[in-house]
Interface confidence: low
Amino acid sequence: ILGGREAEAHARPYMASVQVNGEHLCGGVLVAEQWVLSAAHCLEDAADGKVQVLLGAHSLSQPEPSKRLYDVLRAVPHPDSRPDTIDHDLLLLQLSEKATLGPAVRPLPWQRVDRDVEPGTLCDVAGWGIVSHAGRRPDRLQHVLLPVLDRATCNRRTHHDGAITQRMMCAESNRRDSCKGDSGGPLVCGGVLEGVVTSGSRVCGNRKKPGIYTRVASYAAWIDSVLA
């Protein structure tokens, strides 16, 4: 997260760290007791490593009573996701067992009504992604509030030049932005999961390249079918 600040510890109990061989790779969001939603491209970077999900964490390194690392029973990328595009950039991870819920571990309701978030709405994005020019990674969860940007502006030639589909949404990115390592994490508007940080290699922190988020409401049928 660029231009953000440290999150209040355990105030986002839905927050997940998707890890490979014990290292944070991507963000994720607990959407059901045994399911974490993340970004499909995160799997590409996992190579043949062991994928696990850390729940109940604030610090990645320090012992915390609520922290628990879960093995992944099944990884389900969206069937239409492709390595060369950010379209359909969603991934569902089934945990090896149901998560132990509590104040620091709780699923987040996700938007099912397929309607665009009003431009200008302030939404919260959180993650353990890089926080500096130099690529410094934080140990503790960071967050930032970002205004939603209308799709027409986001699709301007000087911005994303028509690449933003109806199934995506944008947020402003002027120095405050999600970035590398935040992919798969949640964009939360009004306490509801609206978007998932896409995991393309987009430049970040640059006002001319707004943050791109996959709209979960647009994939309600797919999510329900996998969770069923």
Partner: antibody, heavy 116, light 109 residues
Framework: EVQLQQSGAELVRPGALVKLSCKAS????????MHWVKQRPEQGLEWIGW????????IYDPRFQGKATITADTSSNTAYLQLSSLTSEDTAVYYC?????????WGQGTLVTVSA | DIVMTQSQKFMSTSVGDRVSVTCKAS??????VAWYQQKPGQSPKALIY???YRYSGVPDRFTGSGSGTDFTLTISNVQSEDLAEYFC???????????FGGGTKLEIK
């Protein structure tokens, strides 16, 4: 039509400084990143740095930190590259360019020759 | 620092042939790669961005591919005007720093 018009060739003494200009037409530099690239005779391309002219924010390749200073004047739609403490190693063609995911437009280049 | 290596400094081909110029990144750069063509005495010209997207006006015989660390610029049906040096370039996702490869000179037999 997008064009980047660079200033003319410079012959400068070692230890001196030089300031090159790149005047843009066909677009507003405030909407883009402006870059400078160095190319020594018969050699490859070296990225020097960029400026976001809207706010003056700059990033440099560490090799050029202290050597190069990039500025921009939005009123004249012009980007500048200043090189200080010149040595023979600075003899090169310097290009300005525009872009972010790639440098879509380039100036014609300015040859700087450092010679006593 | 990320290093972009174009191992072949020179390549020779004939008109009508297909040729592939390769570039290797020292670490994963995703698809953050552009390709440029520079003819003798001219400024570089942008061909490809984001590994595989052609700039407008670039003939479709120029194709970019690759992701991660290995990238290729393929010129099919080579023309005499393709005699030039070709450079790859990577850009970090943040803070947008750039590195060029050393270049590959294409000679037409």
């Amino acid at each position: 039509e997008v064009q980047l018009q660079q200033s003319g060739a410079e012959l400068v003494r070692p230890g001196a400084l030089v300031k090159l200009s790149c005047k843009a037409s066909g677009f507003n530099i405030k909407d883009y990143y402006m870059h400078w690239v160095k190319q020594r005779p018969e050699q490859g391309l070296e990225w020097i740095g960029w400026i976001d002219p809207e706010n003056g924010h700059t990033i440099y390749d560490p090799r050029f930190q202290g050597k190069a200073t990039i500025t921009a004047d939005t009123s004249s739609n012009t980007a500048y590259l200043q090189l200080s403490s010149l040595t023979s190693e600075d003899t090169a063609v310097y290009y300005c360019s525009r872009g972010l995911l790639g440098f879509a437009y380039w100036g014609q280049g300015t040859l700087v020759t450092v010679s006593a | 620092d990320i290093v972009m290596t174009q191992s072949q400094k020179f390549m020779s081909t004939s008109v009508g042939d297909r040729v592939s110029v390769t570039c290797k990144a020292s670490q994963n750069v995703g698809t953050n790669v552009a390709w440029y063509q520079q003819k003798p005495g001219q400024s570089p010209k942008a061909l490809i961005y984001t590994a595989s997207y052609r700039y407008s006006g670039v003939p479709d015989r120029f194709t970019g591919s690759g992701s991660g660390t290995d990238f290729t610029l393929t010129i099919s049906n080579v023309q005499s005007e393709d005699l030039a040096e070709y450079f790859c370039q990577q850009y970090n996702s943040y803070p947008h720093m750039y590195t060029f490869g050393g270049g590959t000179k294409l000679e037409i037999k």
